[in-house]
């Protein structure tokens, strides 16, 4: 039974100086973990893995590494130009065994469409995944194989929300002892039956995924045969009982007033830090309206910014966020209207999110200019469009067949994005890059470990 | 390389008619999609018409139909846009263009285009 209760991952997540330059506050960056969090909580909380049920994750500690770090020498993630294996080893050379789990998050460009990756886990035997602890392998270095890493940049261009929670679920799902998923079974999006291909490939798919089909943020029934073994045998080694709130870890949770760290952390005047006692932590301090860690609309000074201050850009579908001088939260912000152009023309505002294909302004659905003889390489880059239903109908935005709505301009997709039936990305060239799944992984192998740990990392 | 070149444009009274051409510099055009477009001063270049390689098929804005016909000469590798009833709203610079064999090919060859200008 005290089995059943331990439920719960506890994670460390630090972020490098590039993610920081890219979210530009602590603040965002706090909230971009947060989000990454709760996104693979609801994803694994939801998934009966062979009996085991709620799943869920909890952030133990973060390190953000700001533009001040970038020359520190203790920063391990302080290098300009690392691939992303050295990158997934620099965070494996730490001691992560007070955690279930250890990730890096960071805004690099890493070669061929590459994501994360990260260590895989297997019931027995097993070096990498979940709760693994630090030992010394054949390199003669001491690694901590309960690790991942994962970006939001690919091909010069930042992916989407939606696919980086899906990135994070995926090298976390590898953690959790599944490899990538193949078979027909479990790669529907390869089907050349209509009905079951429109639903998409699921979380473990080897290659790209849009991240708003059916299927995309769902494990295969193969991730979960393995991932249930995996989690039968290894829970019990570091899993939690979950509820309580963890002071210290950045996030204002269920109990907590605030949240600014621990002391080496906390650069806040309105909150005690972690390391305060029992009564104090996580609580405002006497006379403060509020904390930064609560939300943008909080003054360094502790108090409510007034109703006019912005705390959210303008974007693509929604308008900027407004304080409204009573909360330190950003109220939500209005949308524009559906329809409205976004993400260079390729899509279009649904419900203030930049989600629906350009076709779809015009009754039509996005299909893949994939090609099967191989002819038409070139405009597997285009955005391309069909009549519901009919695949038959599918070619570019700058076809003959859809001139009345696109006047003869070929809409290129964003570089970063699926093309090719999902089986690549775009270049910056508008080149559609088959992504090699497992290439990383056996330079990784070659490099430094001996043949017993060779099946045990993966994108 | 083929070579476009629209001519036919000038300024046309409201109400008025004008017949545009485009001369294609290759015989291949004979069975390609032909189409024209056009961009007003500050607008986004807009569809016209096309027409198929045999003439068979052809497909109109909603702007213009009833108004203009598209119609080719192959033995003189020419496009033709017969424009009546004009409208102060139909001055702009007007493209023919070239796609491939399908209606689903992309228009790859563009003329340099001719003014047309619709006094009221």
């Known amino acids: 039974t005290t089995s059943a209760e331990k439920n719960t991952c506890q994670l460390y997540i630090q972020t490098d100086h590039l993610f920081f330059k890219y979210y530009g506050t602590r603040e965002a960056v706090i909230a971009q973990i947060s989000s990454h969090v709760k996104a693979i909580d609801t994803i694994y909380q939801t998934t009966d893995f062979s009996g085991i049920r709620n799943i869920s994750f909890m952030v133990k500690r973060i390190r953000i590494n700001t533009t001040a770090d970038e020359k520190d020498p203790t920063n391990p993630f302080r290098f300009p130009n690392i691939g992303v294996e050295k990158f997934l080893e620099l965070n494996s050379e730490q001691n992560h065994d007070d955690y279930c789990l250890a990730y890096v998050f960071t805004d690099r460009d890493f070669d061929d469409g590459v994501l994360g990756l990260a260590w895989v886990g297997a019931p027995s035997g097993s070096s990498g995944g979940i709760c693994e602890k630090s030992k010394l392998y054949s390199d003669g270095k001491k690694k901590s194989l309960n690790t991942g890493i994962i970006t939001v940049q690919n091909y010069g261009s930042h992916v989407p929300p939606k696919v980086s929670h899906i990135t994070f679920a995926h090298e976390v799902g590898h953690n959790f002892g599944s490899p990538h998923d193949s078979g027909t079974e479990c790669t529907p999006g390869e089907s050349k039956n209509l009905g079951q291909k429109e639903n998409g490939n699921y979380i473990m798919y080897a290659r790209a995924t849009s991240g708003d089909k059916l299927n995309n943020n769902k494990f295969s029934l193969c991730s979960i045969r393995n991932i249930s073994q995996v989690l039968e045998k290894k829970r019990n080694n570091c899993f939690v009982e979950s509820g309580q709130p963890i002071c210290g870890n950045g996030m204002v949770e269920q109990g907590e007033e605030c949240d600014c760290g621990y002391s080496d952390q906390c650069k806040d005047e309105c909150c005690f830090d972690a390391n305060q006692p029992e009564g104090r932590k996580c609580k405002l301090k006497p006379g403060k309206q509020c904390s930064p860690s609560q939300g943008p609309c909080c003054t360094a000074q502790c108090a409510f910014k007034s109703k006019s201050e912005k705390c959210r850009d303008d974007s693509d579908c929604a308008r900027e966020g407004i304080c409204n001088g009573f909360t330190a939260l950003c109220p939500a912000s209005d949308p524009k209207p559906n329809f409205t152009d976004c993400n260079r023309h390729t899509q279009v505002c649904i419900n203030g999110q930049c989600a629906g294909s350009i076709c779809e302004k015009y009754g039509l659905e996005e299909c893949t200019c994939a090609s099967s003889d191989g002819k038409d390489d070139k405009e597997l880059c285009h955005v391309c469009c069909m009549k519901k239903m009919d695949p038959s109908t599918c070619a570019s935005t700058g076809s003959v067949q859809w001139s009345r709505h696109f006047s003869g301009r070929t809409i290129t997709l964003q570089p970063g994005s699926p093309c090719n039936d999902f089986r690549g990305y775009c270049d910056v060239f508008m080149r559609c890059r088959l992504v090699d799944a497992d290439g990383p992984l056996a330079r990784l192998k070659k490099a430094i470990f001996s043949p017993e740990l060779y099946e045990n990392i993966a994108e | 390389e083929v070579q476009l070149v629209e001519s036919g444009g000038g300024l046309v009274q409201a109400g008025g008619s004008l017949r545009l051409s485009c001369a294609a510099s290759?015989?291949?055009?004979?069975?390609?999609?032909m189409g024209w477009f056009r961009q007003a001063p500050g607008k986004e270049r807009e569809f016209v018409a096309f027409?198929?390689?045999?003439?068979?098929?052809?497909d109109y804005a909603d702007s213009v139909k009833g108004r203009f016909a598209i119609s080719r000469d192959n033995v003189k590798n020419t496009l033709y846009l017969q424009m009546s009833s004009l409208k102060p709203d139909d001055t702009a610079v007007y493209y023919c263009?070239?796609?491939?064999?399908?209606?689903?090919?992309?228009?790859?060859?563009w003329g340099q285009g001719t003014q047309v200008t619709v006094s009221s």
């Open positions: 263009a070239v796609a491939g064999r399908q209606i689903k090919s992309t228009w790859g060859y």
């Open positions: 290759e015989r291949i055009f004979s069975t390609y999609f």
């Open positions: 027409i198929s390689g045999n003439g068979g098929s052809t």
